[in-house]
């Protein structure tokens, strides 16, 4: 109706890098900008994904390099994280959320894949992480070794090769293990500490070059007490699990001080392992049962999980599976394993500013089921598995329904703000709940919409509109881009009224009759008033439409409802010929070249492109008869 | 030659405080522990206090714990035993005894005893 | 706490007598019980250590046993000088408390 297609702004970047994922419109102090997400981008050996600034009028784009923010004490895995896969402004700071919800640490021996998003403020710096769904690792752990270096260990060798193997076994990194070892004998030292080392090559090597101090007497406790009091507070950390591994080959010269040295490690929750080296007692034929028991005493409870003993010093190395799987074992405490919590929820795959925060949609939360997370100043809030049984039955836990595939709100006047989140595949059709979120992690779901057909993806985008601008939601769009129809994925934009406090069915949008795949309702964005009519205005993309070309469709808004048939539609090939996938980001809530009227931002593969507003001249024919 | 040594006891009027020492010879204090055993007159003998020379851990029997405390000064080969408090029934010949590894946790030496009277 | 009771507290024997003593500790121990002997206006004196094992210089007539919870010391063949008290004393594990028995009194009938 009223864009401007004759001089587009196309602002090219990386079809590689699949810039023009995301766009959103940005403003500083005056300054018009777009913000781009390109999350398949390189940053040096990793496909990390980025988001640009590009100025609106001319001039190039500025990669944030927001792909090289760390995470302090995780061993992150950035590659293929997607960043820029969401976006989310706050209108309130112009600061904006920027999502990797393929973000992954290590633990253990897996990744989990939790997500992170990077919160930019107005000025394009980087502010703060946004990690609601990181949790420690199970590997978080400080894990002392208590070797017994007096001269009746014997060939030392042998404990060196074992001390070597079982490192080895450790997931050592920032976040998870940090391992450090003391030995004893007459006296105790610190061969190196618990923050040392960061990886297990520098631990290994540094264990290498350990050498036998000798001695002629074992004082064992003095050796734990020494670990327990010294070396897991010389670089131990706070919340990390403590574990002893405690390696003798004999009785102990102060056996009597073990009672208050072991009640202290228990005090402080430090797990013990104990391992008996018999050789001393083979080699001469002693009965090592007084050993054994004093050994099992330092042991944690029960002793079959926690005491190991061998016949010599060679025997070590038959013990070194068992025993790093024991202290894995650690990992798995109090927990299902089969099951998913928040380990691999993707959070940020989608997000929403609220007036308290950010919502955060995390599809692989609960075994794929999804779930939605908030982010608040105060803290953060992770609903429940319980708290959508409700509307996700038990019985369809493994279907992987995406909840969380998007994530927006509305705004009742009897209720206020709701959220709303889209769950695309739930029972194969697709669902839409509107809910708020407690403290306590539990969840109101006020309504639920189910899609019509399986594969559909109802609910894969979800846009809330604000027709006449009273700060109450008039109509809520849901998408169902894969909707089948006339054998194509041609999609559906289904249309719902506010009524009192519940949403109802109104029809659904009229896209164009080609047939070819569109994907009409890939995204859906609730732009300010286009046509000067003091409605706002709902654009849709359909980026499959004209052979992956991509189009746009704008629909008018008027008296608290929406025009269900397009008053523009833009194609791909009339605004500049190579663009693919046009439409499958929009924003259009600025007026970018100041005047006065909003202009849109579209993105496509490799492109954003800017649609700028004409004004409309509302002429009033009038007609006067002489005479009359 | 392993040998111990008491000194400091004597005569002491209830609710007063004596200061017994232990000092060892022959042996390295640090290696051992220092136990103080009494004995009553005409009677058997009861166990006091113990300490650990080099980690300090210390242990009282209930009779005496709060008013009684072992320490050890290993530059001195020393043990002491401070006594406050001190009643009619902690009227007796207080002896040190050695107590390590080596003797399996026995109390292989004595010392020869020192008097403590605790009388009005 | 672990107590240590002794008995008999008194006993008269001649020269050449064989002499037994017993503790019974009132749980189980582990096999840190030593026994001790103490003349009048002396300090005692370690005789066995471990349950079983002789001291050194201590003649080998003195011997000690365990079975289950009770300790026995026995002097085969009782001599002149071992007219005396003779006390059982057990070590708490891994802690140095110690408990003495009440004493037997070995005097000559």
């Known amino acids: 109706f009223n864009m401007d297609t004759r001089k587009p702004r196309v602002i090219p970047g990386s079809r590689t890098a699949f810039f023009g994922y995301t766009v959103q419109q940005h403003d500083i102090s005056g300054n018009k900008w777009l913000v781009v997400g390109a999350p398949l981008e390189t940053n040096g050996y990793q496909k990390t994904g980025d988001v640009y600034k590009c100025p609106v009028i001319h001039g190039n784009c500025t990669k944030l390099n927001l792909g090289r923010v760390t995470l302090s004490n995780v061993s992150e895995r950035k590659d293929n994280m997607r960043l820029g896969l969401s976006l989310a402004t706050n209108p309130k700071d112009n600061s904006f959320l920027a999502c990797s919800p393929l973000w992954s640490h290590e633990c253990g021996s897996s990744y989990y894949t939790t997500g992170m998003c990077s919160r930019v403020n107005s000025n394009f710096r980087f502010s703060k992480t946004v990690a609601p769904a990181l949790q420690r690792c199970q590997t978080y752990m400080d894990i002392v070794i208590v070797l017994d270096g007096s001269n009746s260990i014997y060939p030392w060798v042998e404990v060196q090769h074992f001390l070597i193997n079982i490192l080895k076994k450790f997931y050592i990194g920032p976040g998870q293990i940090q391992v450090g070892v003391v030995q004893y004998g007459e006296d105790v030292v610190h061969e190196f500490h618990l923050n040392d080392y960061r990886s297990v090559k520098d631990v290994v090597e540094a264990a290498s070059h350990i050498e036998q101090r000798g001695g002629t007497e074992t004082r064992t406790a003095f050796g734990i007490e020494f670990a327990r009091s010294e070396a897991f507070q010389k670089g131990g950390r706070k919340g990390a699990k403590k574990v002893m591994i405690v390696i003798t080959d004999g009785e102990s010269h102060d056996s009597p001080d073990l009672e208050k040295v072991i009640q202290q490690s228990e005090r402080d929750n430090v797990t013990r392992y104990a391992v008996a080296v018999l050789g001393y007692y083979n080699r001469r034929g002693i009965n090592p049962e007084t050993f054994l028991n004093e050994i099992k005493y330092i042991a944690s409870d029960p002793d079959d999980k926690h005491f190991f003993n061998v016949t010599d010093e060679a025997a070590l190395k038959d013990i070194v599976d068992a025993l790093g799987d024991r202290i894995f074992s650690l990992e798995g405490t109090n927990k299902n394993e089969t099951s998913f919590g928040l380990e691999m929820s993707q959070t940020g795959f989608s997000s929403h500013v609220v007036e308290d925060g950010v919502l955060l949609g995390a599809v692989g939360a609960y075994d794929w089921n999804g779930a939605v997370l908030k982010e608040t100043s105060a803290g953060k809030v992770i609903p429940l598995r319980e708290s959508y049984l409700k509307e996700f039955p038990e019985e369809l836990k493994n279907h992987g329904a995406y909840l969380g595939y998007t994530v927006t709100s509305v705004v009742s006047s009897r209720q206020g703000r709701v959220y709303v989140a889209g769950a695309p595949r739930f029972n194969h059709t697709g669902k839409v709940i509107l809910f708020t979120m407690h403290n306590n992690r539990s969840l109101t779901i006020h309504q639920a919409m189910r899609g019509q057909q399986i594969g559909s993806y109802f609910g894969s985008e979800i846009t809330s509109v604000d027709i006449d601008g009273d700060g109450v939601t008039d109509v809520l769009l849901v998408g169902a881009p894969m909707y089948f129809n006339e054998g194509r994925e041609r999609g559906k934009v289904y249309v719902y009224e506010l009524r009192q406090n519940l949403f109802v069915y109104n029809g659904t949008l009229k896209d164009s009759h080609s047939y070819q795949n569109a994907r009409f309702g890939s995204s859906i964005a609730s732009v300010r008033d286009l046509n000067q009519d003091s409605y706002n205005d709902v654009v849709v993309g359909a980026p499959l439409e004209d052979n992956h070309a991509g189009a746009i469709y704008i629909f008018h808004g008027f008296r608290g409802s929406i025009l269900k048939t397009p008053k523009q539609r833009i194609t791909a090939s009339e605004l500049a010929t190579g663009l693919q996938y046009f439409g499958c980001s929009i924003h259009g809530q600025l007026d970018l070249n100041e005047d006065g009227l909003i202009d849109l931002a579209v993105g496509a593969l490799g492109n954003a492109v800017i649609l700028w507003s004409r004004p409309v001249v509302q002429i009033n024919a009038s007609l006067h008869f002489e005479p009359s | 030659e392993v040998q111990l040594v008491e000194s400091g006891g004597g005569l002491v009027q209830p609710g007063g405080s004596l200061r017994l020492s232990c000092a060892a010879s022959?042996?390295?204090?640090?290696?051992?522990?220092i136990h103080w055993v009494r004995q009553a007159p005409g009677k058997g003998l009861e166990w006091v206090a113990s300490i650990s020379s080099y980690s300090s851990y210390t242990y009282y029997a209930d009779s005496v714990k709060g008013r009684f405390t072992i320490s050890a000064d290993t530059s001195k080969n020393t043990a002491y035993l401070q006594m406050n408090s001190l009643r009619a029934e902690d009227t007796a010949v207080y002896y040190c005894?050695?107590?390590?590894?080596?003797?399996?946790?026995?109390?292989?030496?004595w010392g020869q005893g020192t008097l403590v009277t605790v009388s009005s | 706490d672990i107590q240590m009771t002794q008995s008999p507290s008194s006993l008269s024997a001649s020269v050449g007598d064989r002499v037994t003593i017993t503790c019974r500790a009132s749980?189980?121990?582990?096999?840190?019980v030593a026994w001790y002997q103490q003349k009048p206006g002396k300090a005692p004196k370690l005789l066995i250590y471990?349950?079983?094992s002789l001291d050194s210089g201590v003649p080998s007539r003195f011997s000690g046993s365990r079975s289950g919870t009770d300790f026995t010391l026995t002097i085969s063949s009782l001599q002149p000088e071992d007219f005396a008290t003779y006390y059982c004393?057990?070590?708490?594990?891994?802690?140095?408390?110690?408990?003495f028995g009440q004493g037997t009194k070995v005097e000559i009938k």
């Open positions: 004393q057990q070590s708490a594990p891994y802690s140095s408390l110690i408990t």
């Open positions: 022959g042996f390295n204090l640090y290696s051992s522990y």
């Open positions: 749980q189980s121990v582990s096999s840190a």
């Open positions: 005894a050695r107590y390590w590894y080596y003797s399996a946790w026995a109390l292989d030496y």
């Open positions: 471990s349950a079983s």
